[in-house]
Each structure stands twice: as C-alpha cells, then as structure tokens.
Interface confidence: medium
C-alpha cells in the first residue's frame, strides 16, 4: 500500500506512517515504528503540556514572583499552566500578569466606582453635585451632602464635590 | 514468547541500595525501549525510569531521581536498575517492561518485591 501523506485526528506523519500524539499532560520519548506505538512519558511534578503533541520536553509550570506582587490563583497541573495573579491591593499590569502594581486611588472630588481586582484597576468618577468624597481611598464611594431639613438644620455652607455642607440651626425671628 | 523475568528485589535498610536485574527473551531485546514500572501495596502502577533501545537516552520519575539508574547490556539482553539511598517510600514490587504507551505496557514481567524497613 502507498504510505499515507495525512494522518487522522490526533496522529502525526513520520517516516511516511502516522504515529499517535501524546495526550494532554505527557511528552513525546519514542516515535512510533513498524512493531510499536508511540511511547510518552508524564511531565514532571512542575511541568506542562496542555494539548495533544509530539514535544520531547515539557514546559514549566509559571513561577507566581511574590517579589513582582504576585501570587497563584490556581495550581498548574500536568495538563495546564499555574495562573498568578496579584497580591490584595495590587493588579496586573498584562492579561499574562507578568506582573503587578499598586491599585490607583480615587482623588478627593473623586469617589471609586469600580473597586479594583487583581486583574484590573480602581476607577474612579466625580463626584456630582449632591455628593462628595474629602478622601484619597481605593474603597471610598462618593458620599451624599447631608441633609440639613431631616435635621430641622439650614444649610450654613454650602457643599462641594470634595466637601460636605455644614448645617446650622435655623435663625429664630427674636419677638 | 516475549518473556521478563526480574530478580534482586529484597528486604534492605533505608539508606540502603539493590541492584534488580531483568532478563528478556523471545523478542530482539536491542531494538525496544524499555522500562520499570513499581506498584505499591494497595496504589497504582507507576512508572520508574525509561532506556531507549541503545542505552543512549534515559529518564526518571521525579520521585527517584538522583537515586536510581537504569542500564542495559544488549549483548546479554539484560535490563539492570541500580536503586540507592532507598526510602521506606520505595516499597513496592517492581516491573521490567516494554512498550508503554497510554498507561498500558504490552508485556510486563511477574515482579520482584523490594521492602525498604528498618
């Protein structure tokens, strides 16, 4: 018979006949041959191969840096990688997350709408009318003006997007 | 007929070293890749080391890497591994085999128990 030119789902061509790949999570040692199947051995303790291949070595799994602000979110195993991400307070600076810096905090006159993550960064808005924020925070929303009238209060002074309005008590007409 | 026949295995100390030996016939034991293989009581079959058919190539599971040596003499068609520093770990009934693929072997030899105890 002529020797095949394309192999099937999971195989490969070499030395004009169609070997099995390796599946997930082991390494190519040995090609198939005429008497014998393709050998593949498992990756080691910190190594990889997450799809069906003919690798002689397998990849290593990714080193979470805590010195870079990271740390791991999930444990490679023998069929995929470590993901890292980062330390509470920091966000990636990649998808890949290579590496992390310190979440942005919101200005005053600024008040956070989103709250960071590890993957992604505070972000902030201005604070509309009605509302301030008198502090530099990652957390802090922009807080409503007090009301003076549940208060039985007038308003003294008047608020603005980083400060509150200050209430006073109301002027008694003197008899 | 494709016959293994393993021998060495034994009672030693931790610490300690043996050396199993395996025995092949009915097949031309200088053209297959072969292997160890061990099973520990009441655990699975794992695989040891791998020698390719010339001897040239070699490979370790982590767990006995550094410790144990694969070889093989083909002109007395004959697979050796050399075990030191042996653990109490190591306990388990060893296997020469060829052909693994998929987590199966095509032929595998009876066994020799090695016992590492003090």
């Known amino acids: 018979p002529e020797p095949p030119t394309a192999c099937r789902e999971k195989q490969y061509l070499i030395n004009s006949q169609c070997c099995s790949l390796c599946q997930p999570g082991q390494k190519l040692v040995s090609d198939c041959t005429e008497f014998t199947e393709t050998e593949c051995l498992p990756c080691g303790e910190s190594e990889f191969l997450d799809t069906w291949n003919r690798e002689t070595h397998c990849h290593q799994h990714k080193y979470c840096d805590p010195n870079l602000g990271l740390r791991v979110q999930q444990k490679g195993t023998s069929e995929t990688d470590t993901i890292c991400t980062c330390e509470e307070g920091w966000h990636c600076t990649s998808e890949a997350c290579e590496s992390c810096v310190l979440h942005r905090s919101c200005s005053p006159g600024f008040g956070v709408k989103q709250i960071a993550t590890g993957v992604s960064d505070t972000i902030c808005e201005p604070c509309p009318v009605g509302f301030f924020s008198n502090v530099s925070s990652a957390f802090e929303k922009c807080h409503p003006w007090t009301s003076c009238e549940t208060k039985d209060l007038v308003v003294q002074q008047a608020g603005t997007n980083k400060t509150d309005v200050v209430c006073g008590p109301q002027d008694r007409l003197r008899a | 007929e494709v016959q293994l026949l393993e021998s060495g295995g034994g009672l030693v100390q931790p610490g300690g070293s043996l050396r199993l030996s395996c025995a092949a016939s009915?097949?031309?034991?200088?053209?297959?890749n072969m292997w160890w293989a061990r099973q520990a009581p009441g655990k699975g079959l794992e695989w040891v080391s791998?020698?390719?058919?010339?001897?040239?190539?070699?490979y370790y599971a982590d767990s006995v890497k550094g410790r144990f040596t694969i070889s093989r003499d083909n002109s007395k068609n004959t697979l050796y591994l050399q075990m030191n520093s042996l653990r109490a770990e190591d306990t388990a009934v060893y296997y020469c085999?060829?052909?693994?693929?998929?987590?199966?072997?095509?032929?595998w030899g009876q066994g020799t128990l090695v016992t590492v105890s003090s």
């Open positions: 009915g097949f031309t034991f200088s053209a297959y």
């Open positions: 791998w020698i390719n058919s010339t001897g040239s190539r070699t």
């Open positions: 085999a060829k052909n693994w693929h998929r987590g199966r072997f095509d032929y």
